[in-house]
Interface confidence: low
């Protein structure tokens, strides 16, 4: 049997026998274009493709549409994998989305959506989510039905304000919505009463900016 040399996601890498967490090269569906991603091979059985990570404020997340489309940061630290890759990937097969959150008091929580995909760029990478479970709130902190993605230079929200400019970062803003994991990073003791921080309203409430976040996806049939 010929060994698989290209992988579309971290689940394929895991199933090929590479079960150590780290940076791997993925290939766009139906293409030879490559992208580097962090694969979490430890959490909940492994095979997770990390599409977003925040941990220390070392990377600026107030980026342009093009940067959010193509990805930025370092897969070893804070990064955004890229809307185009995620859209193409999740358009081919059914994926679940797991969001892991840490607060400044040592608590952790997660939200798990049993179906996640991003529409194409022509639909502003609109997010689609169903089937929420987990410990980070019984109500989805990503507004339902899903919103279009907005950045500082591409305002697609439902607010007369420009949510991305007002709250910082690119996100699926509604008007402006109860979450923004790409907001301004605030250190401990400066992380409360922050309008533009890293927000997950239905876990930590108003104005609380989180310590760390990870968004990761995996095929539903893994």
């Amino acid at each position: 049997k010929e060994e698989q040399t290209t992988f579309r996601d971290c689940a394929e890498i895991f199933k090929s026998g590479l079960t150590t967490s780290g940076i791997y090269t993925l290939t766009f569906p139906n293409s030879t274009e490559e992208i580097k991603a962090y694969c979490d091979m430890d959490v909940g059985g492994g095979g997770w493709t990390v599409i977003q990570h925040r941990e220390d404020g070392s990377v600026d997340f107030q980026r342009t549409w093009k940067e959010y489309k193509e990805g930025f940061g370092s897969p070893l630290g804070e990064y955004w994998l890229g809307n185009e890759f995620v859209s193409q990937l999740t358009g081919q097969h059914r994926y679940v989305l797991k969001i892991q959150l840490k607060d400044w008091e040592g608590n952790e929580a997660h939200s798990l959506y049993d179906h996640f995909y991003l529409a194409g760029e022509e639909s502003n990478y609109r997010i689609h989510l169903t089937g929420l479970t987990g410990t980070a709130g019984k109500i989805s902190s990503i507004s339902q039905p899903g919103s279009d993605f907005s950045t500082k230079d591409s305002d697609n929200d439902k607010c007369i304000c420009k949510c991305s400019q007002m709250l910082s970062g690119g996100w699926w803003f509604d008007a402006c919505g109860p979450s923004n994991l790409n907001g301004q990073y605030y250190p401990q003791k400066q992380n409360t009463n922050k309008f533009n921080g890293i927000k997950w309203y239905y876990w930590k409430g108003s104005g609380y900016s989180l310590k760390a976040t990870t968004m990761m996806i995996r095929p539903a049939d893994f």
Epitope: S143, K158, A175, P178, F195, K199, G205, S206, G207
Partner: nanobody
Framework: EVQLVESGGGLVQSGGSLRLSCAAS????????IGWFRQAPGKEREGVSC????????YYADSVKGRFTISRDNAKNTVYLQMNSLKPEDTAVYYC??????????????????????????WGQGAQVTVSS
């Protein structure tokens, strides 16, 4: 019963000023986001400005930035829209509105009901503003 009543509209010459008031009853206005919207004849209602509950953050449409100022007097349970350097294109019926959800526990803007017309379900009757050239 929640009620919003606008006042202060009228006829003014281009370059002039008006101050609109939005008096609220039936709820404590300071915990709620209040938006000002306007509708010109034959056009869709559009957002002008809003002030969020709790933290009084303010937002303005690009077309009015630097000319309009929104403010809140909690003691009077009233929100104001000070309109300076008025232009003929500012002619419209001006409405104030709030979201019944309100998020009394904190700033409505944090929850997400800031300035979208779609989010608001309590509206005043409107105040006519006419700017002549």
């Amino acid at each position: 019963e929640v009620q919003l009543v606008e006042s202060g509209g009228g006829l003014v010459q281009s370059g002039g000023s008006l101050r609109l008031s939005c008096a609220a009853s039936g709820f404590a206005l300071d915990y709620y986001t209040i938006g000002w919207f306007r509708q010109a004849p034959g056009k869709e209602r559009e957002g002008v400005s809003c002030i969020s509950g709790g933290d009084t953050s303010t937002y303005y449409a690009d077309s009015v930035k630097g000319r309009f100022t929104i403010s809140r007097d909690n003691a009077k349970n009233t929100v104001y829209l000070q309109m300076n350097s008025l232009k003929p294109e500012d002619t419209a019926v001006y409405y104030c509105a709030t979201d019944s959800a309100g998020v009394p526990a904190g700033p409505a803007a944090v929850y997400g009901s800031t300035c979208s017309r779609l989010e608001y379900d309590y509206w005043g009757q409107g105040a006519q503003v006419t700017v002549s050239s």
